[in-house]
Interface confidence: medium
């Protein structure tokens, strides 16, 4: 299907590419001595980039700092120094640049202020950083300003004094709506959820916090939970971990109505040293990690039903080091239903696993064609691909980038990996899949930085090296053939690749610095590939592809979550522009239902290798500890529930007698007396 990658051979040689790229390579040298650079894109398809350079000298008592702000409006080909727009103020890099949602054009920079000042200072822009307004704050911010996803004029921030501050006019005026706030988040419809401590402090009251909600930006409040440890939002679900009455364990409760009613999630409770983590969530379901007791470094992934209440065990021994630590869990955004993560074996080796059906079944990644099994493999002919992700990066392995996929580059996944029985500490190579992870091929020897341009029409890579570099590699056929382009005669110490988020652009910026005896000078090279892909793609450049196809003889071939999708994909041999307006063309078709389209409802489970759901023996004839909507209630079930997001129709309907599961509600989490409504007078 695809051969081993070739570099600079006659394989798909592009005529005059050096001349075409030389004419479209733009250098910008930054005239300052900064130690660090941060870059942000402002808006979508605007071409606007902001670059903040900072230089800090820690002196004995205070630190001296200087910032410079640069702006490009042509995707990084040219930059203009706009430091004067922020009055040459030193910007606090830990707050970054707060870029507004969607195409609002809003930017907030948080400035450093002198010790005795009453509050902080921000610079605000609502015109894609053409102009900035200086605003002095009535508080010192603890966190970056958070924009409401629904209205970019609404902002919230926490102060160093744990006050919750809200602005309704893009930071011009601020009001403290609550004190003693530990964590605050925007929910849907401009709702703010936050936890407050009642007695001492956020840390001391962990597990005794209250969860509050305001739907009117702080005019009125409702306490929606007590004995809270923490809370989180994922998809349409609001989660809270709640302390148990009897001991120091805590349990997850879930709400789908912004906290008006709660149900106890059917997940194991966790102790003080353990944690829950929402790995991924959408409008249909959630992936939840539950940490194992003890300092094991692993836990279990559970997937939820459509209510977020009933959970199926998805993957055992899932690698997740500590709270807020490292997990390799990756959503492969280029193909629906695909996720990759790592498990920790009994022998402490780390192995990659992939699911193609949203966590229903996990398997090892198929060994790339024509690849040899490395030293980790017991059997030199049978092994699998193991992907390096966050954990490897945290362990300082020679892995410059996490796996990469883009929704509009259908089926493409690029990642560092090794071929064996487990992840290897040896120098990894770069592998590519063009079918969403079903099959893999080695793309590049050794570690590289990589990015996807023009919705997959071009892949760009730069070798990861300690030495200065001046070569960029690119492929127009999904990583099969590679051309090398020398973008500068003066090699630079490479620090990063920057391309506009969304992978629609044809521009790539190569960032780095040159170093002389005493000075370091930042430089960027922006390469525009528009003349490599000189014509627009036409109908004949695309071919149909059935996603998830593994068995063309099977009537359910390609069916994932009850439907299959045929995509129009660019032929590997076509060298043309998808273009900025490219929309992924797909034709979905509904599949007939089979038992694979159903999960087991509360009180039921699937025996190993079985299709049917059966009653859990330990629950037969018992009152079930189950709490739905915070009150005792009869739960009727036939043992099956359609998998969240599954669209199958007809076929098999697992109808059988409906059982009435009598149960007692053991959650006093929502004691009605606690559900006060308060007004902010």
């Amino acid at each position: 299907r695809r051969g081993a990658p070739a570099e600079d051979q006659d394989c798909g040689r592009l005529p005059d590419f050096i001349a075409k790229l030389t004419n479209n390579t733009h250098q910008h040298v930054f005239d300052d001595l900064s130690g660090s650079v941060s870059l942000s894109w402002v808006g979508d398809s605007t071409g606007v980039i902001l670059v903040l350079t900072t230089f800090q000298v820690p002196l004995v008592i205070v630190s001296f700092g200087q910032s410079k702000l640069y702006r490009s409006e042509d995707y990084g080909k040219n930059f203009k120094d706009i430091t004067n727009l922020i009055n040459n103020t030193f910007i606090r890099t830990e707050f970054g640049m707060a870029i507004g949602p969607e195409n609002s054009g809003k930017v907030i920079l948080t400035a450093e202020v002198s010790g005795g000042s009453r509050g902080g200072r921000v610079f605000r822009s609502s015109d894609f950083a053409k102009n900035f307004v200086q605003t002095d704050l009535p508080f010192h911010p603890l966190t970056q300003m958070m924009y409401s996803p629904q209205n970019s004029d609404y902002l919230l921030a926490l102060s160093t004094e744990n006050g919750l501050w809200v602005s309704k006019n893009f930071g011009e005026k601020w009001e403290e709506i609550h004190k003693a706030v530990c964590l605050a988040k925007w929910g849907p419809n401009n709702i703010i959820f936050f936890t407050t401590h009642v007695n001492g402090s956020c840390k001391a009251d962990l597990g005794a916090l209250e969860l509050w909600r305001t739907s009117d930006l702080g005019k009125t409040f409702k306490t929606i939970g007590v004995k809270i440890y923490s809370f989180g939002l994922g998809g349409r679900f609001l989660f809270a971990s709640v302390m148990a009455d009897k001991d120091t364990t805590r349990r997850i409760h879930v709400s789908t109505d912004q906290g008006d009613t709660w149900s106890m999630a059917q997940l194991p409770s966790v102790g003080q040293e353990q944690f829950y983590s929402i790995l991924a969530a959408n409008e249909d379901m959630v992936f939840m990690h539950v940490d194992e007791p003890g300092d094991t470094g692993f836990g279990t992934i559970f997937t939820s039903d459509d209510r977020g209440i009933v959970y199926s065990k998805s993957l055992d021994r899932h690698l997740y080091t500590t709270t807020g630590g490292e997990t390799d869990f990756t959503n492969v955004t280029s193909l629906r239903g695909v996720y990759i993560t790592s498990t920790l074996s009994e022998d402490n080796s780390i192995q990659s696993m992939i699911t193609f059906d949203q966590g229903g079944r996990w398997e090892h990644l198929r060994k790339p064609e024509n690849s040899k099994c490395d030293a980790t493999a017991k059997n030199k002919n049978e092994c699998s691909l193991h992907i390096h992700a966050s954990y490897s990066i945290s362990q300082k392995l020679n892995v410059p980038m996490a796996p990469l996929s883009e929704p509009n580059a259908v089926g493409i996944v690029i990642a560092h990996g090794s071929v064996g029985d487990a992840i290897s500490v040896m120098v990894p190579d770069v592998y590519i899949s063009d079918d969403g992870g079903y099959s893999w091929a080695k793309m590049l020897e050794g570690p590289h930085y990589y990015t996807i341009l023009d919705s997959g029409g071009i892949i760009v890579a730069i070798e990861h090296s300690n030495r200065p570099i001046n070569v960029i590699k690119f492929s127009t056929d999904e990583g099969q053939c590679w051309q090398s382009y020398v973008f500068t005669q003066e090699p630079i110490y490479f620090t990063g690749l920057a391309s506009e988020p969304g992978a629609r652009s044809m521009n790539i910026s190569i960032w780095g610095f040159t170093e002389s005896f005493i000075t370091r000078q930042w430089v960027s090279y922006t390469v525009d590939f528009k003349d490599i892909l000189e014509r627009n793609c036409e109908e004949d450049d695309y071919t149909t592809w059935l996603a998830h196809s593994t068995d063309p003889g099977d009537y359910k071939d390609g069916c994932i979550l009850g439907y299959k999708e045929q995509f129009l994909r660019l032929r590997k041999s076509s060298v043309c522009q998808n273009g900025r307006d490219y929309v992924v063309a797909k034709q979905p078709s509904v599949c007939p239902c089979s038992l694979e389209d159903f999960l087991c409802d509360f009180g039921y489970f699937r025996p190993e290798n079985a299709s049917e759901c059966v009653e859990q023996p330990e629950l037969k004839g018992h009152e079930l500890e189950f709490c739905l909507y915070g009150k005792e209630e009869h739960l009727t079930t036939n043992g099956y529930r359609k998998i969240p997001g599954d669209k199958c129709q007809g076929g098999m309907n697992p109808a059988r007698e409906v059982k009435d599961l009598k149960k007692k509600c053991t959650s006093n989490f929502l004691n009605p007396t606690k559900q006060n409504s308060k007004s902010n007078s």
Partner: antibody, heavy 121, light 109 residues
Amino acid sequence: QVQLQESGPGLVKPSETLSLTCAVSGYSISSGYYWGWIRQPPGKGLEWIGSIYHSGNTYYNPSLKSRVTISVDTSKNQFSLKLSSVTAADTAVYYCARGPPELGKMYFQHWGQGTLVTVSS
Amino acid sequence: EIVLTQSPGTLSLSPGERATLSCRASQSVSSSYLAWYQQKPGQAPRLLIYGASSRATGIPDRFSGSGSGTDFTLTISRLEPEDFAVYYCQQHGRLPPWTFGGGTKVEIK
């Protein structure tokens, strides 16, 4: 070793209901697996009638669905077939059989020896 | 429903010869979902092959299955006297009905 044994009347009158039971030994029905009925008219080929899982989920041949009921009795470790409104065309050797617990693997590894049922007045 | 047609209806061969039995489906069947059975007079069928090519427990390796899509084959590499019987194919996919072919009789020439 799992063994299956069909039992029931060898002669049934037309329009009446054919009732057969399959007794399972050497394996607990409630431990999983699909349990099925297959028939073979004299000198002819095999026809799948239906299958049941121990939890009670049933799957029937559409051509017989309106007349067939398969049920399971886990306490007696047996499952049963009822075929109503029989005609001479229902004369066949009736086999009970066991298949794996996975749909998509509805082949039959273990069979009873079969029982001949004749429909005649 | 998927109709399975077996050919030939009767195959006359001598012991030691190679037997090739065909099973054709009216629509595509996944190779994962085709089985073969052997039935001798007065006996229940016996499972030989499932998943088109996997031998059932205790089946000698002279029996092999192959094929995909609509065409499947059961091969008996060297016929033994006890192999003369009727052979049925069956599709066992994820949705009912699960159907059998009409059978091929392998008789002694």
